[in-house]
Each structure stands twice: as C-alpha cells, then as structure tokens.
C-alpha cells in the first residue's frame, strides 16, 4: 500500500531492535502463499516438519499459520540519530510449539520446536508490500528475507531497496 | 537527528508550475517509502502522493493524477513533487513524510512549503 | 475511497479531565489481521505527529496517557488526563489501502 520500504543498511540494525512487550500485540491465522498463488505447506515427517512451496489442487485444504505480532524499538543507526522508530515483527507457528527459524549459516528456513521466550532467529519485520503482498526480513540478518528457491522456503539477500520487488520474497495472506 | 526538510513553496498563478523538494538526514533515506500530504489553509490533510524506497511504485491522489509527479534522487537524499497545471484548489502546506521501517504507517514528519496558486 | 468521520467537530474540556474522541470508518480498515488506522496530533503552526498507530499502539516517545482502541470500523483514541500540551487537533488516518485518508479532525480546546 505505501509501496516498497527498502533495505536495511544498518550495521548493527535489527540485531538491537528491542521488541516492545512479551506478548504479542495481536495474532492472525492465515493460510500462506506466494506471489505466484503457490501454497506453503507443512509435512510432518520423520518426526520434524518439512516445508514446501507446491500448486494445491483444487479444493485441497490450504495450511494455516498462525502470525503473532510484536511492536518493535527500530534502532537508531551507528551515526547515532537518536531516534528510535516503531517496527512491527512476527513469528510464525503453523502448528503448537513449532516456529518458523531463520537458519542463516545454512541459508535456509526450518521449522523448530522450542519454548518462550523464542528466539530471535524466529522474529521477523513484517513489510507492508505493494500489490497486497507482505515480505519478511530476519531480526537477526537485516536485509536478508524469507523467500523461495527450488520449491523450498529460503533465506535470500536483498543488496538494494530496487531488488525488494523480486517476486520471490513476495508473499500473501489470506484468511481462506 | 531525523530530519526532513521542505522547500520550493510559493507564490503561483492558476495553470502554472513548481517543484517541491523534501531533504531528508539523519537516515537510510533508500529503505524508506516516502510521501507528500498536504493541508489547505484550516483545513485537514489529505494524502496526495508516495513513493517507494526503491522508486519502483507510485501512488496518487485522484485529484493529482496526470498533473503531479513524485519522485526520488536517493543518491542526493531528496524527494520531489512536480506540480503542473496547478489550480486554486491546490493552494496548502506541502508536508514530506516518511513511513516507519516496513512500512505501515507515517512516521515522521517535515515542517511544510507553502503553496498559493493564485492570480 | 475509506471515508472516517470524527467526532465530536470540538470537544471542550478542562486540564485534569479525560478525553474521548471518535473516529468512524466507512468499511473495515483491517488488513492482515491489523487494524491499519492510526491518530496524529496536530498544533498551530506545526506538522502532525504519530500518536497512535495500528489502532492501539503508542508512538516513539509518546507519553502513556494516550491510549487507542477499536477495531473494524470504530476506534477510540482517550487522553487519560488532559495536559496543557494536550489541546490541539487530532486526525485519524487509515493506511490500510490507497487513497490513504485522514479523517476531518477533533479539536480539543479548554473550556
């Protein structure tokens, strides 16, 4: 709706963004899609959950995930402005006590087991996209965001604020 | 400090031109979505035009369209409003605002460039 | 367009007292599970500045005493103890779709 924000350049950026309050400031369970309509879904296998990027058939039920937002200190930056703005983070559960991880060594996303207070790596600054979409930038790698690779959800860097509107880091929520 | 600053606002007739500038400091200017709003005289505010970080979206007013252009320099930190085919009715403060990080709202604001579009 | 209206136009009250202001949307302003409407104060001769955003949450710096609720189409903003520096205009504005658009504004003046 505003268009596209751009990309952290930041050193110390989202690493010292302090989320405002333990709890979340309001939840939301949405199905996730990208911006090519492909579902993202949740297999349990092997005792850990796998996540893909595939075409649903028709009337297949589509996944949920459950979005809990947290109100987020935006750091001043190393030239020290002295302002601290307001960000709006997430974590993402698509079932009970399993959350979206950013692994940044591996470049990959996965889903974890784990109790609160969660991790940083499960945090994510929610981007109000053009064209009805979202985009999810890692707390802890600023300008590296969730996007798809090969059918699978990966970490990708955004080096400039041109490139935030690559298809690949776009995403949909959808109630339905 | 955050800083953005208007300037460009004056005096006009009806049909002629003027372009506003917004310099921004004190930040990342390319990794925010920047705006123009304006207010006439004792009255609200009304959106007129944004621009994203990486000036690849537009958005406008209806009242603007076709007239007005929004744009960026992000190597100079400065956004732009060209006003063409100015009208009465155009006469406000020119406010630059920026969004916060993501996106969501207007964050913070510029003290304002007079417009008069008057004969 | 998102029409908001407020009310009261005025709202005359004394330093000490709480405050109350309305603002009403024409169609639901939630978006991804947000309430995308937020409240900015306004003084004489100065921009606005964020209050409130996404219904109920305070701005940088903004002191306690301002709350927001609602959700859908009816939200609140509530000067829990009117300060000297509290009298001025407030604007909702939703940005939950293009055209953005602010409401016409409640002036809180001392009565």
């Known amino acids: 709706a505003f268009g596209i924000s751009g990309v952290q350049k930041y050193t110390r950026a989202l690493h010292d963004s302090s989320i405002t309050g333990i709890s979340p400031i309001t939840e939301y369970l949405a199905s996730l899609s990208t911006y090519n309509d492909q579902s993202i879904t949740f297999a349990l296998e092997d005792e850990s959950y796998e996540i893909y990027v595939e075409d649903l058939k028709k009337d297949e039920k589509k996944d949920k995930v459950l979005l809990s937002y947290y109100e987020s200190q935006h750091p001043s930056n190393e030239s020290g402005d002295g302002v601290d703005g307001k960000m709006l983070m997430v974590t993402l559960s698509p079932t009970k006590d399993f959350w979206l991880h950013a692994n940044n060594k591996e470049h990959s996303v996965e889903l974890h087991k784990c109790e609160k207070p969660l991790p940083d790596q499960a945090f994510f600054v929610l981007h109000n996209m053009h064209s009805n979409c979202v985009s999810f930038e890692c707390k802890t790698d600023p300008g590296v965001f969730i996007g798809v690779k090969d059918n699978h959800l990966a970490l990708i860097k955004v080096d400039s604020s041109e490139n935030l509107c690559t298809e690949n880091i776009l995403f949909k929520l959808s109630e339905t | 400090e955050v800083q953005l600053v208007e300037s460009g606002g004056g005096l006009v007739q009806p049909g002629g031109s003027l372009r506003l500038s917004c310099a921004a400091s004190?930040?990342?200017?390319?990794?925010?979505?920047v705006s123009w709003v304006r207010q006439a005289p004792g009255k609200g505010l009304e959106w007129v035009a944004t621009i994203s970080g990486g000036k690849t979206f537009t958005d406008y007013v209806d009242s603007v369209k076709g007239r007005f252009t929004i744009s960026r320099d992000n190597s100079k930190n400065t956004l732009y409003l060209q006003m063409n085919s100015l009208r009465a009715e155009d006469t406000a403060v020119y406010y630059c605002?920026?969004?916060?990080?993501?996106?969501?709202?207007?964050?913070?604001w510029g003290q304002g460039t007079l417009v008069t579009v008057s004969s | 367009e998102i029409v908001l209206t407020q009310s009261p136009a005025t709202l005359s009250l004394s330093p000490g007292e709480r405050a109350t202001l309305s603002c009403r949307a024409s169609?639901?302003?939630?978006?991804?599970?947000?309430?995308?409407l937020n409240w900015f104060q306004q003084k004489p001769g100065q921009p606005p500045r964020l209050l409130i955003f996404?219904?109920?949450n305070r701005g940088s710096g903004v002191p306690a005493r301002f709350s927001g609720s609602g959700s859908g189409t009816d939200f609140t903003l509530t000067i829990s103890s009117l300060e000297p520096e509290d009298f001025a205009v407030y604007f909702c504005?939703?940005?939950?779709?293009?055209?953005?658009?602010f409401g016409q504004g409640t002036k809180v003046e001392i009565k």
């Open positions: 996404a219904a109920s």
């Open positions: 605002t920026r969004a916060n990080y993501g996106n969501w709202f207007f964050e913070v």
């Open positions: 169609e639901s302003v939630a978006k991804y599970g947000l309430s995308l």
């Open positions: 004190g930040f990342t200017f390319s990794s925010f979505s």
């Open positions: 504005q939703q940005s939950k779709e293009v055209p953005f658009t």
